[in-house]
């Protein structure tokens, strides 16, 4: 990895577990200001592999609300608007980081957690295995 | 929101900015143990809206490496294997949380940051605007 010189103005840490426990400022900085205003909000309906969005809420997690995509069909929508099973709708998954309250119910103590979420669906050609 | 009784065993915080600055344990807990072994690793190639994955590295961010999807075509791949421009390949984007070193180069002090990443691509019917 890249070695970065330490900033002399860094907060001090006497913690023997350092750097496993760190200080995090929860005032979120949003770097998405220059993103395209034409957001992907309607893609779930217009896709050939459309999906529904399910709300997953957990007050012990930050963010507490995560939206999970579930493909509407096993096949994909063809040009006639019918479901075509020669193609497959599959979820696109991504591992994301969330903060889990630890110990539970603590407002100022968290542990980093990795979870797998389905973000949307895409249409793929199936791998077909025929019986000999 | 849901009010949760505070755990009496929580770490104490005298910080006047509390709960804006919190303690986070970086020993990541991975909750993906029961995920489907059939991972989405090859979907980028088999999709009718295929994509390439670009490595985005930033040592001031945690995680320092994020993979960004970029759709290979403006159109979608049809049954003949050709790009069909009557349909559009579009990126599925998701806002994720990352930790940004703050002040810069500090190993144990971070700020929560929200960034928009492209996870994969999906094929959508275009919105056609006809000239009057």
């Amino acid at each position: 990895g890249i070695t970065i010189p330490r900033n002399p103005g860094c907060p001090n840490s006497e913690d023997k577990n350092f750097p496993r426990t760190v200080m995090v400022n929860l005032n979120i900085h949003n770097r998405n200001t220059n993103t395209n205003p034409k957001r992907s909000s309607d893609y779930y309906n217009r896709s050939t592999s459309p999906w529904n969005l399910h709300r997953n809420e957990d007050p012990e997690r930050y963010p507490s609300v995560i939206w999970e995509a579930k493909c509407r069909h096993l096949g994909c929508i063809n040009a006639d608007g019918n479901v075509d099973y020669h193609m497959n709708s599959v979820p696109i998954q991504q591992e994301i980081l969330v903060l889990r309250r630890e110990p539970p119910h603590c407002p100022n103590s968290f542990r980093l957690e990795k979870i797998l979420v389905s973000v949307g669906c895409t249409c793929v050609t199936p791998i077909v295995h025929h019986v000999a | 929101g849901i009010t949760i009784p505070r755990n009496p065993g929580c770490p104490n915080s005298e910080d006047k900015n509390f709960p804006r600055t919190v303690m986070v344990n970086l020993n990541i807990h991975n909750r993906n143990t029961n995920t489907n072994p059939k991972r989405s690793s090859d979907y980028y190639n088999r999709s009718t809206s295929p994509w390439n994955l670009h490595r985005n590295e930033d040592p001031e961010r945690y995680p320092s490496v994020i993979w960004e999807a970029k759709c290979r075509h403006l159109g979608c791949i049809n049954a003949d294997g050709n790009v069909d421009y009557h349909m559009n390949s579009v990126p599925i984007q998701q806002e994720i949380l990352v930790l940004r070193r703050e002040p810069p180069h500090c190993p144990n002090s971070f700020r929560l940051e929200k960034i928009l990443v492209s996870v994969g691509c999906t094929c959508v019917t275009p919105i056609v605007h006809h000239v009057a």
Epitope: N52, K70, C71, R72, H73, L74, G75, I77, G81, N82, V83, Y85, H86, N88, S89, V90, P91, V124, P126, I127, V128, H129, H130, V131 | N36, P37, K38, Y43, R46
Partner: antibody
Framework: DVQLQESGPGLVKPSQTLSLTCTVS?????????WSWIRQPPGKGLEWIGY???????SYNPSLKSRVTISVDTSKNQFSLKLSSVTAADTAVYYC?????????????WGQGTSVTVSS | DVVMTQTPLSLPVTLGQPASISCRSS???????????LHWYLQKPGQSPRLLIY???NRFSGVPDRFSGSGSGTDFTLKISRVEAEDLGVYYC????????FGGGTKLEIK
């Protein structure tokens, strides 16, 4: 529990269109389910005809696709089957069924079936 | 089309004894999403089919635990640990990975 009831004429002439309706009770149409038609010729096995989702998206058995139309009327809690240009080979018991479309993609509740004979 | 082949065609059994039905598909039933959409139904005389097992091995609500499903890829089995009189009828395997198709049926009858 959800109940499904097929209705329609028991006798259809060759070359005509067979029309059946399925009325769903004790359940509102939602995106979690697809609504299917299956048939069973006398003394034979089951053949899936097609389904329609809450939003009107359909999928048909390729062998019947050119002759089949399935439609839905959510306001009446009904969905319908039309099979055109029928022949004696279309004589069967026709079942409507609810397909769980959220979890396991199969028919979990069926109507009791209606017998249709194609004959002049 | 995916062809589902069931064996045997007819299965004479003694009440209280186990029974096993086999189902083979002409191509793998593993969907691109990793799931296998293979299901089992029972059709009793004069009745409509009733779902027993979904996605290979999951018992539908109200189905007794003497019924179990297993298998993967193209080969699947339905087992009844101890056959009861109410289990008699025609058993169908069905797949919904590549639209819906059914096996030809296996008739479970008293020996």
């Amino acid at each position: 529990d959800v109940q499904l009831q097929e209705s329609g004429p028991g006798l259809v002439k060759p070359s005509q269109t067979l029309s059946l309706t399925c009325t769903v009770s004790s359940y509102s149409f939602t995106s979690d389910y697809a609504w299917s038609w299956i048939r069973q010729p006398p003394g034979k096995g089951l053949e899936w005809i097609g389904y329609i989702t809450y939003s009107g998206v359909t999928s048909y058995n390729p062998s019947l696709k050119s002759r089949v139309t399935i439609s839905v009327d959510t306001s009446k809690n009904q969905f319908s089957l039309k099979l055109s240009s029928v022949t004696a080979a279309d004589t069967a018991v026709y079942y409507c069924a609810r397909a769980d479309y959220d979890s396991y993609y199969t028919m979990d509740y069926w109507g009791q079936g209606t017998s249709v004979t194609v004959s002049s | 089309d995916v062809v589902m082949t069931q064996t045997p065609l007819s299965l004479p059994v003694t009440l209280g004894q186990p029974a096993s039905i086999s189902c083979r598909s002409s191509q793998s039933l593993v969907h691109s999403n990793g799931n296998t959409y293979l299901h089992w139904y029972l059709q009793k005389p004069g009745q409509s089919p009733r779902l027993l097992i979904y996605k290979v091995s999951n018992r539908f609500s109200g189905v007794p635990d003497r019924f179990s499903g297993s298998g993967s890829g193209t080969d699947f089995t339905l087992k009844i640990s101890r056959v009861e009189a109410e289990d008699l009828g025609v058993y169908y395997c069905s797949q919904s990975t590549h639209f819906w198709t059914f096996g030809g049926g296996t008739k479970l009858e008293i020996k």
